[in-house]
């Protein structure tokens, strides 16, 4: 049903417009200070713009995060904006390309000519609304990692999930981030019912496999109080 | 691969409405974000409407805020465009988008896959 569709916490799927634009929920798309935006009858061509809303970086490509596309602009309305190329200015690091990371707001290449055997990398994770580092939630933390050529493997500190091997997300454990297995069928899974609630995760789960959604267990045997257990199901 | 056939195009007055559907098959479970897009006869395709999947978080283009609603049906598997007073400019092929991948498949960018598209003429 649509419920994968409308009620989940995965959008994704759509050319990212240049820089984005998103409204107020509910609202025109408007232009914005430094980014592309449709005016009157002035609209970019469908392979520039299609704004993809979104409630998570996740939801995006790995060439792009989720946020709101002007500055100070409502939370609840963000879409897929192109990501930050090195030394341009960031606020988290899904901002920044893949092969790059966020650090002291700007992006920065993490390519192993930069970093080589153990570093000291500080992740800034937020909660609640995962674009901002200026909630009640913010964290830092500083973890020692190391970066590899190769995709990171079960338990390796990533940044996004594209630094997982295949089969793998980065999804969050305790204050940090690290390569976690995607989820296979029957495997309980969380069902995010209000937007922005997976940032309260600290023990977070994948997402479920390919041709799998994350839906309510049919079973009648069940108590009522745990009838609410999700897992992964094919359709 | 997901299969969008769109419904309910046709010809209505200026002022009046029409309520277009879309409805999804397939692979329905990448899903997490439908759209509304037309394209008027040589002009470039252009978007109008699109609902999220996490938060129901609805954008608009400009020209049909507070005219035109978009909305889905979870339970048909159905998205839909209400369109009211409508314009003779609002004539064009509209056709519905489906966001479908992204980077939980490894794509670069979030994506939409097309339906074929329906007719909605305005004129007296």
């Known amino acids: 049903t649509l419920n994968s569709v409308l009620n989940s916490n995965a959008i994704k799927n759509l050319p990212p417009p240049l820089g984005g634009a998103a409204g107020h929920p509910g609202s025109a798309v408007s232009a914005a200070p430094g980014i592309l935006y449709p005016g009157g009858n002035k609209y970019q061509t469908i392979d520039n713009y299609q704004p993809y809303p979104c409630a998570e970086d996740e939801e995006c490509g790995t060439d792009e995060y989720c946020a709101s596309p002007t500055r100070g602009g409502d939370a609840g309305v963000q879409i897929c904006l192109a990501c930050r190329k090195r030394r341009k200015r960031c606020m988290r690091h899904a901002m920044c390309c893949p092969g790059n990371y966020c650090k002291n707001g700007i992006c920065v290449s993490s390519d192993q000519n930069h970093f080589r055997g153990e570093i000291e990398e500080t992740i800034t994770e937020s909660f609640g609304n995962d674009h901002s580092t200026l909630d009640g939630y913010s964290r830092r933390t500083t973890l020692s990692s190391k970066m590899y050529h190769t995709k990171g493997q079960e338990g390796s500190v990533c940044l996004r999930s594209s630094d997982c091997a295949s089969g793998l997300c980065c999804a969050r454990h305790f204050w940090s981030k690290i390569c976690k297995p995607v989820l296979k069928e029957g495997q309980v899974c969380t069902k995010h019912r209000r937007k922005g609630s997976h940032g309260l995760e600290i023990f977070q789960r994948c997402y479920c496999g390919e041709g799998l959604s994350c839906r309510i267990q049919k079973d009648h045997h069940q108590a009522s109080n745990s009838s609410r257990l999700h897992t992964c199901q094919r359709h | 691969e997901v299969q969008l056939v769109e419904s309910g195009g046709g010809l209505v007055q200026p002022g009046g409405s029409l309520r277009l559907s879309c409805a999804a098959s397939g692979s329905i479970e990448n899903i997490n974000a439908m759209g509304w897009f037309r394209q008027a006869p040589g002009k470039e395709r252009e978007f109008v409407a699109a609902i999220s999947s996490g938060g129901g978080i609805t954008i608009y283009a400009d020209s049909v805020k507070g005219r035109f609603t978009i909305s889905a049906d979870n339970s048909k598997n159905t998205a839909y465009l209400q369109m009211n007073s409508l314009k003779p400019e609002d004539t064009a092929v509209y056709y519905c988008?489906?966001?479908?991948?992204?980077?939980?498949?490894?794509?670069?960018?979030?994506?939409?896959?097309w339906g074929q598209g329906t007719l909605v003429t305005v004129s007296s």
């Open positions: 988008a489906a966001g479908n991948g992204g980077r939980k498949y490894g794509h670069h960018r979030a994506r939409y896959d």
